[in-house]
């Protein structure tokens, strides 16, 4: 079991369902979306590879008072084993281009689905 | 509306291969979230999940059967095959095939199912 | 492997009832439980999904509850096309499982 408590139930929950509850969050998001998301603010680009939770909690932890993504800020970070501050971008190996936040969670919620219809939960 | 129909050997020997072909209209397997699966029902009995096959070709199988399925997808003909190999008399069952979410969340329902087809294995 | 329990393979009731039909997993499923039902010619249909969402097209006498491993389907004034099986199927983990299905018949 991966110690992701905290966003969904009290105590450790197994890495499947964390990631299960990421997804749905996103969803949620894609889903319920009216007016652009976070007033169409920009995010860096992430590569979806290895430390791919860090990179985007460190992209999207830029965005500030932008309460539809709250939640998802903070279920990143229990995928991701260092604290991340505004500003951060050791995981962001690559820093070249700005997508809208809409843009950049479709994109995250199309490579975490893939990832755990695959049973890649870690 | 969406349809799927399957369509197999009716009956087949022990040791062969068992090959079910899944013909679906209504929905396209290269839209994002969409699956199709195969479940099986000796007579009588309940229902056993085999195996599903996504949109980006990701395949999932029952583990107790892992070794003897493969499971295969067509977009353009809008077809999903399933081959068993060396069946025995307890692979004989109703086959269907289903459609896997629509919903966009990961809820593994089966949304739609064929009508089934029925498989006998005897020597 | 999740096992899914239905412990009444058999339930008789009269047209206009309301039949609640059970379903119980061997562990916590955290809400992914659809129920379908199989009508005597084989014909198998979605009737809700995620514990209680209907699937689009069944009837609004259908409704299912439940959380963690207990579950139910609720036809809430039983016709006479309901006159089917009723199974149960996890969709938490893989394998998906199915529970041994409740045969539903009119007195």
């Known amino acids: 079991l991966t110690c992701l408590g905290g966003f969904a139930s009290p105590g450790p929950v197994p890495p499947s369902t964390a990631l299960r509850e990421l997804i749905e969050e996103l969803v949620n998001i894609t889903q319920n979306q009216k007016a652009p998301l976070c007033n169409g603010s920009m995010v860096w680009s992430i590569n979806l590879t290895a430390g791919m939770y860090c990179a985007a909690l460190e992209s999207l932890i830029n965005v500030s008072g932008c309460s539809a993504i709250e939640k998802t800020q903070r279920m990143l970070s229990g995928f991701c084993p260092h604290k991340v501050s505004a500003g951060q971008f050791s995981s962001l190996h690559v820093r070249d281009t700005k997508i809208e936040v809409a843009q950049f969670v479709k994109d995250l919620l199309l490579h975490l689905k893939k990832l755990f219809r695959e049973g890649q939960f870690n | 509306q969406v349809t799927l129909k399957e369509s197999g050997p009716g009956i087949l020997q022990p040791s062969q291969t068992l090959s079910l072909t899944c013909s679906f209209s209504?929905?396209?397997?290269?839209?994002?979230?969409?699956?199709v699966g195969w479940i099986r029902q000796p007579s009588g009995k309940g229902l056993e999940w085999l195996a599903h096959?996504?949109?980006?070709?990701?395949?999932r199988y029952n583990p107790a059967l892992k070794s003897r399925l493969t499971i295969s997808k067509d977009t353009s003909s809008s077809q999903v095959f399933l081959m068993i190999a060396s069946v025995d008399t307890a692979d004989t069952a109703t086959y269907y095939c289903?459609?896997?979410?629509?919903?966009?969340?990961?809820?593994?329902?089966?949304?739609?199912w064929g009508q089934g087809t029925s498989v006998t294995v005897s020597s | 492997d999740i096992q899914m329990t239905q412990t009444t393979s058999s339930l008789s009731a009269s047209l206009g009832d309301r039949v609640t039909i059970t379903c119980r997993a061997s562990?916590?499923?955290?809400?992914?439980l659809n129920w379908y039902q199989q009508k005597p010619d084989g014909t198998v249909k979605l009737l809700i999904y995620?514990?209680?969402r209907l699937h689009s097209g069944v009837p609004s006498r259908f409704s299912g509850s439940g959380s963690g491993t207990d579950y139910s389907l609720t036809i809430s004034n039983l016709d006479q096309e309901d006159i089917a099986t009723y199974f149960c199927q996890q969709g938490n983990t893989l394998p998906l499982t199915f529970g041994g299905g409740t045969r539903l018949e009119i007195k």
């Open positions: 096959i996504w949109w980006d070709d990701v395949k």
């Open positions: 209504g929905f396209s397997l290269s839209t994002s979230d969409l699956g």
């Open positions: 562990q916590d499923i955290r809400n992914y």
């Open positions: 289903a459609r896997i979410g629509s919903s966009g969340y990961i809820y593994y329902e089966m949304d739609y």
């Open positions: 995620y514990t209680s």
